[in-house]
């Protein structure tokens, strides 16, 4: 029988790759394979066997599988062996090309090309081009000292030119175990080349001018040459040398200038590489001064507000300010100056602040002055109203408005009105010599009715000064009407019925009209006249009544206009129970002996108590009080049967008792035949 | 200065766990396979585990595999050794080393109970 | 596991003489790109190993050329012409032909 193997005599493996190795025979139907390596260690590898084939499997390769793998074939009683040298080599990825920085044409630019992972490296060759043309070239002949997986890089510094844009930088990795075609052993890495040109010849062209007056436009507009094209980044140069960043356009327009806009303006062009600037001297001059007071000429100001007038300079830089009223009068106001403003507050106003204000603006030899009339009201909160009571149907009432703190006084209406109608109208017309804060009422009497509830009762009050600028010249104040209506027609319900039997049950709900609706309570009379509360709700609801539940019950119905009451008497009637029939002294008497015999019913009132005496001729009816019968010297007749009944609309309950009578000779006793 | 230094190294009980650490410096640590190396009590060298300048591909001897892991950062130009279920007979000194050109001082590990 | 055996265990040398010391791999350490991956440490006392010769017979840098290494297959020698007293502690051999990598057993070297 023949042994062959594939690959037949030599395996290149990269290291981590999966790897076959299949040993066959032929002219063997059953042969027995085993696997070793020539130095007899472990096999690192799977081995499978199917009929006349053995495949060992080694995934991942790794340094313990470099051996000379011996696969042997038994047949019967004769043996083969072959040998497959498997051998390593790592080279996994594609070298990778790094720059010391971006190319700029002219500067000296250092390139590193690194193999990684690589084995064996003494058998490595790296080759850097630009173009076609070969930079360096490097074999790592001394490298390998141990068989181990390193990074290998190839550097070299060269000058970039302008020619040089758009060529390619080649690195190309060579591992030289080429003695098998089907192994990829040149690998090699492209980038193209980018060359950049600092930025140069940056220039600035500025319209109007560069002499310019306050309150004046410009334009500067900044070009560079370079590659990329330079960015353009304008700054102003401060005083102590440093740069304030202002824009980063080509185009820069200044609008409104003023005295500080004066200075020197650089523009910058900057790309990736570099920066190159250029610098403009503007010059800003000065321009004739305007007063602005604010708010305006006129001014409402509230008494006890603070009120705060600014004059403000346009066009000069330092002005000096100086504030008076029309008349010379004291300022009674604060005045704080700053820069080209000066504020005079008045805080709080009052009537001596009714004045025109002047500010004189003094700026170099120039002055001028602005006024500001400052007039007063005082009309600081929404009417009050109150009433002399609680809203009742049919009962009067006296309604007050009244206005607080008003100023001035002669310009003052106050209206009332009920929904759309009105009730009251005053106006207070009349002349006042004194500057002061009065309070100023409306009073009105009315009988309300149920109608009237829901309106609203307006109270509006106006100032009648339009001629000043504030708001609000109107506030008014509004009520709405609820109309108490007394508890009235007061009703109970009860469910089944005021007369019930023990045990049942009973609803007895409560009715009462008024508004706002009346609440209701529930309460029992007591035996000595108080009322004992029961419930807030509108139906009281007895469970499982008792005899004790008897009694008078009284519903009453409260609002704030007053109470209303109804009673009803509930009546729990009981079936008799508990009866006892005695005889006093004793049920055995002797004759001539007093017996009282009295039936008593524990439980009930209101039950009628029947006693009779049986006999075989008839019963007799005795005639008794409050259940007593009372026998005066008994005979011998009244022995026998006496019966009790006691008896309601509920039903009844018997007992019976037997007398004996004792006669007085011969000691003989008598007793009833039955 | 080329130079290696571990750290980490401590008394553990038997089936537990440690890290090592191996900080370089002084050359270019991204392009050298690393190894760690012991040296038992009784001065026997054992090498235990092999990276690749990537950090791709790692390599131990039968008597850690699957106990160790060999890792390694780059950026912060360190190696690692992480063990666990650890044995007595994993006592030893460890020393990190590029190749076997350069050796760390070493850091002791004990696993006793 | 290929394994290396160095002899002799100790090696008692007077300072100004020669010193040599074995070791043999139980298999060859040629391998398959013709390269032997054989290195001698020494460590001295109180240190970390250091390397002194790789692939057989090259110094390391700072290494005295009374050092040389030698042999081929499975037969390696380091051998020291004049030993001086900073030559004492251990010396190891190590092969990087077979995974994995192993060490020999160590020879004392003491100083007489």
């Known amino acids: 029988f023949k042994i062959e193997t594939t690959p037949e005599s030599r395996y290149l493996a990269q290291i981590g790759d999966s790897v076959s190795l299949t040993c066959s025979t032929t002219g063997c139907e059953s042969p027995f394979f085993s696997w070793r390596t020539q130095i007899d260690s472990p096999l690192n590898g799977k081995v499978t066997n199917e009929g006349t084939t053995s495949t060992l499997t080694m995934n991942p390769v790794s340094f313990g599988n470099e051996h000379s793998y011996l696969c042997t074939a038994t047949c019967e009683s004769r043996k083969l062996e072959k040998g497959i040298q498997v051998e390593i080599y790592s080279f996994p990825k594609d070298p990778e090309i790094h720059l010391s920085g971006p190319l700029e044409a002219g500067k000296p630019i250092t390139v590193k090309c690194s193999v990684a992972d690589v084995y064996p490296f003494d058998r490595l060759e790296i080759d850097l081009l630009k173009g076609d043309h070969l930079m360096k070239s490097q074999e790592f002949l001394e490298d390998a000292d141990r068989k181990s997986l390193e990074t290998k890089s190839l550097e070299v510094t060269f000058t970039p030119v302008i020619e040089d844009i758009g060529k390619v930088l080649v690195c190309r990795a060579k591992l030289h175990i080429d003695e098998m075609d089907s192994v990829p052993t040149v690998r090699q890495a492209v980038k193209e080349l980018q060359v950049y040109i600092s930025p140069k010849n940056t220039v600035i062209s500025v319209n109007p001018s560069t002499k310019l007056q306050e309150g004046g436009s410009v334009t500067m507009t900044c070009s560079s040459e370079g590659l990329p094209a330079p960015e353009i980044f304008w700054s102003k140069k401060l005083d102590n040398g440093n740069l304030q960043h202002l824009s980063g356009n080509a185009t820069l327009t200044l609008i409104a200038m003023r005295m500080e806009d004066s200075g020197i303006y650089v523009c910058e062009g900057v790309n990736l590489i570099g920066k190159n600037r250029k610098e403009v001297e503007l010059i800003v001059q000065e321009k004739p001064f305007t007063v602005e007071i604010s708010p305006g000429p006129r001014i409402a100001a509230q008494i006890g507000d603070s009120v705060m007038l600014t004059c403000s300079v346009m066009g000069c830089e330092s002005p000096s300010f100086s504030w008076r009223t029309q008349i010379d009068s004291p300022l009674s106001g604060k005045v704080r100056s700053e820069g080209t403003n000066s504020t005079l507050t008045l805080s709080p106003v009052s009537f001596e602040n009714e004045h025109s204000y002047l500010c004189t603006v003094t700026c170099g030899h120039k002055k001028l002055e602005k006024g500001i009339q400052v007039e007063l009201y005082s009309f600081p909160r929404d009417p009050e109203i109150e009433m002399s009571g609680g809203l009742v149907n049919g009962s009067s009432v006296t309604v007050s408005c009244k206005v607080p703190s008003v100023y001035p006084l002669d310009r003052l209406e106050i209206e009332l009105l009920k929904g759309e109608t009105i009730l009251e109208n005053i106006e207070f017309l009349e002349d006042t010599d004194m500057k002061s804060l009065e309070n100023k009422s409306l009073e009105m009497t009315f009988i309300p009715t149920i109608e009237d509830t829901g309106k609203a009762l307006v109270c509006q009050a106006k100032l009648h000064i339009d001629d000043m600028e504030f708001e609000p010249k109107q506030r008014q104040s509004t009520q709405t009407l609820y109309v108490n209506v007394a508890p009235r027609d007061t009703t109970v319900l009860v469910s089944p019925s005021s007369i019930l039997e023990e045990g049942s049950s009973v609803n007895m709900t409560c009715l009462s009209q008024g508004f706002p609706a009346p609440k209701i309570l529930w309460s029992r009379q007591l035996p000595n006249g108080e009322l004992q509360p029961l419930s807030e709700n509108a139906t009281l609801t007895l469970i499982s009544t008792k005899m004790e539940d008897s009694g008078v019950y009284l519903c009453e119905g409260i609002n704030q206009a007053g109470r209303s009451r109804k009673e009803v008497e509930l009546i729990i009637q009981v079936t008799p129970k508990d009866i006892k029939l005695t005889a006093f002294p004793s049920e055995s008497v002797k004759e001539g002996d007093t017996v009282i015999i009295s039936c008593t019913c524990g439980n009930v009132p209101e039950t009628w108590i029947i006693l009779k005496k049986k006999a075989e001729t008839g019963d007799t009816v005795l005639k008794s009080i409050d259940g007593a019968y009372t026998i005066r010297k008994a005979q011998l007749k009244d022995a026998g049967v006496y019966e009790c009944e006691s008896k309601n609309k509920v039903g009844s309950q018997l007992r019976s008792l037997t007398l004996d009578v004792q006669g007085r000779e011969n000691n003989k006793d008598y007793f009833s035949p039955e | 200065e080329v130079q290696l230094v571990e750290s980490g190294g401590a008394l553990v009980k038997p089936g537990g766990s440690l890290k090592l650490s191996c900080v370089a410096s002084?050359?270019?640590?991204?392009?050298?396979?690393m190894s760690w190396v012991r040296q038992s009590p009784e001065k026997k060298l054992e090498w235990v585990a092999e990276i690749s300048s990537t950090g791709s591909y790692t390599h131990y001897p039968d008597t850690v595999t699957g106990r160790f892991t060999i890792s390694r950062d780059n950026a912060k130009n360190t190696l690692y050794l992480e063990m666990s279920s650890l044995r007595s007979e994993d006592t030893a000194m460890y020393y990190c080393a590029r190749g076997e050109a350069l050796w760390g001082q070493g850091t002791s590990v004990t696993v006793s109970s | 596991d290929v394994v290396m055996t160095q002899t002799p265990l100790t090696l008692s040398v007077t300072v100004g003489q020669p010193a040599s010391i074995s070791c043999k791999s139980s298999?060859?350490?040629?391998?398959?790109?013709?390269?032997?991956?054989l290195n001698w440490f020494l460590q001295r006392p109180g240190q970390s190993p250091k390397r002194l010769i790789y692939?057989?017979?090259k110094l390391d840098s700072g290494v005295p050329d009374r050092f040389t290494g030698s042999g081929s297959g499975t037969d390696f020698t380091l051998k020291i012409s004049r030993v001086e007293a900073e030559d004492l502690g251990l010396y190891y051999c190590w092969q990087g032909t077979h995974f994995p990598w192993t060490f020999g057993g160590g020879t004392k070297l003491e100083i007489k």
């Open positions: 298999h060859s350490l040629l391998d398959s790109y013709g390269k032997t991956y």
């Open positions: 692939l057989v017979s």
């Open positions: 002084g050359f270019t640590f991204s392009s050298y396979a």
